[in-house]
Amino acid sequence: MVPEEEPQDREKGLWWFQLKVWSMAVVSILLLSVCFTVSSVVPHNFMYSKTVKRLSKLREYQQYHPSLTCVMEGKDIEDWSCCPTPWTSFQSSCYFISTGMQSWTKSQKNCSVMGADLVVINTREEQDFIIQNLKRNSSYFLGLSDPGGRRHWQWVDQTPYNENVTFWHSGEPNNLDERCAIINFRSSEEWGWNDIHCHVPQKSICKMKKIYI
Amino acid sequence: LGEPQLCYILDAILFLYGIVLTLLYCRLKIQVRKAAITSYEKSDGVYTGLSTRNQETYETLKHEKPPQ
Amino acid sequence: LGEPQLCYILDAILFLYGIVLTLLYCRLKIQVRKAAITSYEKSDGVYTGLSTRNQETYETLKHEKPPQ
């Protein structure tokens, strides 16, 4: 026979057991709480620092772009691509049609003040998108020039000039003194490029990379 | 670690914790039920507690000296 | 709802579930122990408590004095 336990020992044993179990419960709940807090606070700080970064990034642009239109890129809430509000977006770029008439150099300077360049057209799709926003009776400067007058055309952003991806009107370029390129509409050939004098005031198209925040 | 990744890791931890605890809870519940049935069947006999062969989780952590 | 928001909602649910289950489990554990002691007291002197082979969860954290 097993000797009988004293009632107070049994009480004490139960009390110890309860203490152990509830201690473990508290420890488990504390661990869960720590995990949960870390999950809530760290991302919050992460979001906060990300927001601070975004705000400082936005502040850079604010002087010339008081408002941006942003869209969420993909599924991730962190990645937003923005264009200044009056600008239109296509693929990874933003476009702005400037209706003020200015020389090529002044047009390029105006674009650069806005963090952009005169438009560099890399594909037929890009040109097709751009022309949707143009008026047929106007001409618009491109970011393409030949300052030396030796037919060494160059894009303002140093993109290599590729003869295979050009959309000159037939017979153009045709004048060594005409060192800047425009895009305009000709009824026979639709939209295409033409060389003109750089000092002649024209409308222009600015292009900038989307702002990622 | 990025914000969503951290959340997913925590999800996994909580999920596993939940599963383990659910299993333990169910197991304990079943044992209690079994013990109650056994107790009822053996109520004219001596043994009315939990089955002698029942081994709880973590049993091997410490070898307890059996009662003398 | 976006993907990250869903993750946080799931986190909260799992967190609450974990807490509730922890409490329930501990409560049940104590009930089992109490039941065992009660069963022992009612068994006219014969030891019919938990099996000598039975080791409870986490029991081993403290060396318990065996019943004399």
């Epitope: 003194d177 060192r179 003109i196 | - | -």
Partner: antibody, heavy 121, light 111 residues
């Protein structure tokens, strides 16, 4: 040798008209943009109008827009300035000048001797 | 329009001395490495004659004592050493955009 010779100046009443000519020689006239620049007595130089080499582009300052017309005849190596509705402030020596392009702009490398236009009643 | 302001309006220099004329534009007349300011000399009773193009390039046939410098809005024409035959009016001109404009002129006299 490059030569630019202006003609057609004279005395004219306010509201009257004159047509100035500039005969070019010694270079391929059709390859160059041309301009008219004037100088009022005792004053500085003032640009009056420009025409591109291919006749595709003409430009005027606001002071003469709608009154003056620049034109060229590449076959005759000649540059013209038709001046209508003349005013007293149009009194000046009128020079024709050849444009040379340099990067994104141009300068005037050769000038004629000038022809004098006097608008007076 | 781009306004060009020349200074001084007149200048008297002894032969062998240096004469410096400045031209300030109301806005930049440079684009990257191109500085689109030009200088002309006009002697009494004669048409203007090109001296310097592109801010610092000496036109062929112009004596090396003439030199030009500057960028953006501030440009300088230097005659060093000045000679008696340099008595004339000097004009700066820009044509980076239409209308092309001239400075008001600087009259250089030899003492």
């Amino acid at each position: 040798e490059v030569q630019l010779v202006e003609s057609g100046g004279g005395l004219v009443k306010p509201g009257g008209s004159l047509r100035l000519s500039c005969a070019a020689s010694g270079f391929t006239f059709s390859s160059y943009g041309m301009s008219w620049v004037r100088q009022a007595p005792g004053k500085g130089l003032e640009w009056v109008s420009t025409i591109s080499s291919g006749d595709s582009y003409t430009y005027y300052p606001d002071s003469v827009k709608g009154r003056f017309t620049i034109s060229r005849d590449n076959a005759k190596n000649s540059l013209y300035l038709q001046m209508n509705s003349l005013r007293a402030e149009d009194t000046a020596v009128y020079y024709c000048a050849r444009q040379i392009y340099y990067d994104y702009a141009y300068y005037f490398d050769f000038w004629g001797q000038g022809t004098t236009v006097t608008v007076s009643s | 329009d781009i306004v060009l302001t020349q200074s001084p309006a007149s200048l008297a220099v002894s032969p062998g001395q240096r004469a410096t004329i400045t031209c300030r534009a109301s806005e930049s007349v440079s684009f990257r490495t191109s500085h689109l300011m030009h200088w002309y000399q006009q002697k009494p009773g004669q048409p203007p004659k090109l001296l310097i193009y592109g801010a610092s390039n000496l036109e062929s046939g112009v004596p090396a004592r003439f030199s030009g410098s500057g960028s953006e809005t501030d440009f300088t024409l230097t005659i060093n050493p000045v000679e008696a035959e340099d008595t004339a009016n000097y004009y700066c001109q820009q044509s980076i955009e239409d209308p092309p404009t001239f400075g008001g002129g600087t009259k250089v006299e030899i003492k």
